[in-house]
Amino acid sequence: NQDLPVIKCVLINHKNNDSSVGKSSSYPMVSESPEDLGCALRPQSSGTVYEAAAVEVDVSASITLQVLVDAPGNISCLWVFKHSSLNCQPHFDLQNRGVVSMVILKMTETQAGEYLLFIQSEATNYTILFTVSIRNTLLYTLRRPYFRKMENQDALVCISESVPEPIVEWVLCDSQGESCKEESPAVVKKEEKVLHELFGTDIRCCARNELGRECTRLFTIDLNQT
């Protein structure tokens, strides 16, 4: 095992900026921090096959799949996607690791699938497998929160029936007018579904997930109806 190269697989997620970078590139565009994909040796596979955690991205996202190889000497490589071979230009970083990158621009269904990277080094040959799919955001919803009084307790539950499950927070303000803006020092935020002590002149519950944030204001009349 210690004879095998140390492989690091990362995903780089790019902010969409209509850059005209080619499909396979050694120098990806300016982007967010690399995200480790937990590359692991695939058990019971013929040959040395590493697999990266499954990548799930939004449609139209631009990403880079990148492999860093800690192996002595030169490396040569080849990308294969849906039976097509794609050229590969490895380069070396400051730590003398071989770096191989595949840039996928504006992700579409046709670009989803298995990306195989074949690497040949002086010591050994191995394959790295990336699986890229498009996240199904059609199922995502963000609904405005509503309130329910807890049975036998002097407490309120804030509910938002959203997918993925939202983060729910109470926003409480004990002041009048302008000073109840969210950045105001008069505002108290509690990131919990259940509120045990009601205080303030302005009480709201907010739910947020990947689709954004929705808030509902609690009026005194609601307390009698929940």
Epitope: G38, V55, E56
Partner: antibody, heavy 127, light 107 residues
Framework: QVTLKESGPVLVKPTETLTLTCTVS??????????VTWIRQPPGKALEWLAH???????SYSTSLKSRLTISKDTSKSQVVLTMTNMDPVDTATYYC???????????????????WGQGTMVTVSS | DIQMTQSPSSLSASVGDRVTITCRAS??????LGWYQQKPGKAPKRLIY???TLQSGVPSRFSGSGSGTEFTLTISSLQPEDFATYYC?????????FGQGTKVEIK
């Protein structure tokens, strides 16, 4: 570099609710099939799996503690939160969070368990 | 729930010894098993996954075998840094469960 860091109260009173936060860096809970799990270890005892949550919001809980546990994630803060209600002195333990990468198997996913762990946070339950 | 029974619960050995730890599952778990090493005051570290695949960076003196209900962790030649507690973990079905641990001590 992949890191996970647990944070939360050092001391909790019996019957109170414990809220623990796992802040992750070096990997994402959005763009890859990744999970975060919670494990605990009472002093001098074995490891006990508590719960986990995946990037697709799939969750699982320990059978014996299911009624007391809630796991959630806040991807914008790269955090996973575990709450445990009605704490008791027997819940005194070191609580760890760890990462679980998910690998594609056709239309399904496969997990090899936890590959990277946080350093743990000790929680004492006492009045 | 699947019960994982580890044996022995502790053992004494000398540097250079061959050490074998066994983990038995109460029902078949294919090869959905990992081995973890834990040193006092530290977090566990994965040694083996999928019953027999060595984690990257782990010395080759560690090896795992087995499938179904019987699994083994072997340290071919015990080194001073190997004195620790070892746990097996099944991740075949929920809830995931650990063995009770095997403490490897210096003879």
């Amino acid at each position: 570099q992949v890191t996970l860091k647990e944070s939360g109260p050092v001391l909790v009173k019996p019957t109170e609710t414990l809220t623990l936060t796992c802040t992750v860096s070096g990997f994402s809970l959005i763009n890859a099939r990744m999970g975060v799990t919670w494990i605990r270890q009472p002093p001098g005892k074995a490891l006990e799996w508590l719960a986990h949550i995946f990037s697709n919001d799939e969750k699982s809980y320990s059978t014996s503690l299911k009624s007391r546990l809630t796991i959630s994630k806040d991807t914008s803060k790269s955090q996973v939160v575990l709450t445990m209600t009605n704490m008791d002195p027997v819940d005194t333990a070191t609580y760890y969070c760890a990462r679980i990468p998910g690998y594609s198997r056709g239309w399904d996913y496969y997990y090899y368990g936890m590959d990277v762990w946080g350093q743990g946070t000790m929680v004492t339950v006492s009045s | 729930d699947i019960q994982m029974t580890q044996s022995p619960s502790s053992l004494s050995a000398s540097v250079g010894d061959r050490v074998t730890i066994t983990c038995r599952a109460s029902q078949g778990i294919r090869n959905d098993l990992g081995w973890y090493q834990q040193k006092p005051g530290k977090a566990p570290k994965r040694l083996i996954y999928a019953a027999s695949t060595l984690q990257s960076g782990v010395p080759s003196r560690f090896s795992g075998s087995g499938s179904g209900t019987e699994f083994t962790l072997t340290i071919s030649s015990l080194q001073p840094e190997d004195f620790a507690t070892y746990y097996c973990l099944q991740h075949n079905s929920y809830p995931w469960t650990f063995g009770q641990g095997t403490k490897v001590e210096i003879k």
